[in-house]
Interface confidence: low
């Protein structure tokens, strides 16, 4: 399985919400004894891999933001620690998993990156992941509201596979 | 079988350093978090620290950061933890453990113990 | 970091007993809760992981319960196998936190 980032780049401007997406793409096991592991974090544009450095979203682990379930589930975290520091993870039916980030302002900008485990029998077989860059803007030139831009389907940083 | 066998403790002095290895085998070792856990005597468990499987993120306790540095080499199945500044406080058994799940913090399989005593 | 809480410390019960420890979490950890085995001079051995997931390998007779902040581990029917001490830890976020242990002896 691969996962893709629909978006590259999010320019949003301050003090609005933004869903970032990942999606997992390709034949996914149903299996009973399979399961998957999402989520997010933050990090750089590291010289060797882009996404090498897992670092807190607005002071939230990785660990804070998984989501643990089977095949294309939906999922989402209830947990009140996310919910305080406006941020809810969720995935859906059809392989889609989003951060949704309540509130923005300029210190949310940056790289984002999603993290997919695929897990068979305890043992894990597979670790994909995706990034993304958000902006966040002020002032005049802040747009009104989010502007998306799409992933290029050359761009090997934001699809990565199995 | 999943084994996981520590090696590298001993006697130090304070202000010294050591370095523990971990050696893991029965299982892709790159897929999975580890961790330093340890005990000192009579007392409870410590998480140290820990290492992201795939990309070599690591963390630390509050306790160690700036002093210790976890490290993995994946070519050879084994995880590290050079230990600089050694305090009387950090005399302990040390253990090395797996993440269940991948990239959780629950772990599933422990390796025997490596005993550290920081004394002069 | 999120503290846990364990009681008793420490108990004495007899060979066919049901036994029950406690865990307190200091914030909502939902049920990332992990239970462990330990013996003298023996690395511990995890028993329970996501609050009540029985590990593989590990005999029916332990189950654990419980949400948020407050867990339970039961042992239904003490074998002699089971006298050791017991942690429990979170397994929410970084860094991970154990309880003090709690120690089951022979009455």
């Known amino acids: 399985f691969k996962v893709a980032t629909p978006y590259s780049l999010y320019v949003c401007p301050e003090g609005q919400n933004v869903t970032l997406t990942c999606r997992l793409l390709g034949p996914v096991d149903k299996g009973h004894d399979v399961t998957f592991y999402k989520t997010w974090y933050r990090s750089s544009r590291g010289e060797v891999q882009t996404c090498s450095e897992r670092r807190p979203i607005r002071n939230l682990t990785f660990q804070d933001l998984h989501l643990h379930h089977g095949g294309h589930q939906a999922a989402n975290t209830s947990h009140d620690l996310a919910q305080r520091h406006g941020l809810e993870s969720a995935s859906d039916h059809h392989g889609n998993f989003s951060i949704t980030m309540r509130n923005l302002t300029l210190l949310d900008s940056g790289l984002y990156c999603c993290l997919v485990v695929e897990i068979r029998h305890h043992h894990s077989e597979h670790r994909v992941h995706g990034a993304m860059e958000l902006q966040v803007q002020t002032g005049k030139d802040a747009p009104s509201n989010c502007v998306v831009y799409p992933s290029s389907s050359q761009d090997s940083e934001n699809i990565t596979a199995a | 079988e999943v084994q996981l066998v520590e090696s590298g403790g001993g006697l130090v002095q304070p202000g010294g350093s050591l370095r523990l290895s971990c050696a893991a085998s029965?299982?892709?070792?790159?897929?999975?978090?580890m961790s330093w856990v340890r005990q000192a005597p009579g007392k409870g468990l410590e998480w140290v620290s820990g290492i992201d499987g795939h990309f070599d993120s690591s963390f630390y306790a509050d306790s160690v950061k700036g002093r210790f540095t976890i490290s993995r080499d994946n070519s050879k199945n084994t995880l590290y933890l050079q230990m600089n500044s050694l305090r009387a406080e950090d005399t302990a058994v040390y253990y090395c453990a797996r993440s269940s799940y991948a990239v959780d913090l629950a772990f599933d399989y422990w390796g025997q113990g490596t005993l550290v005593t920081v004394s002069s | 970091d999120i503290q846990m809480t364990q009681s008793p410390s420490s108990l004495s019960a007899s060979v066919g007993d049901r036994v029950t420890i406690t865990c307190r979490a200091s914030?909502?950890?939902?049920?990332?809760l992990a239970w462990y085995q330990q013996k003298p001079g023996k690395a511990p051995k995890l028993l329970i992981y996501?609050?009540?997931s029985l590990q593989s390998g590990v005999p029916s007779r332990f189950s654990g319960s419980g949400s948020g902040t407050d867990f339970t581990l039961t042992i239904s029917s003490l074998q002699p196998e089971d006298f050791a001490t017991y942690y429990c830890?979170?397994?929410?976020?970084?860094?991970?936190?154990f309880g003090q242990g709690t120690k089951v002896e022979i009455k």
């Open positions: 029965g299982y892709i070792f790159t897929g999975y978090d």
């Open positions: 996501a609050a009540s």
């Open positions: 914030q909502g950890i939902s049920s990332y």
């Open positions: 830890q979170q397994h929410y976020t970084t860094p991970p936190t």
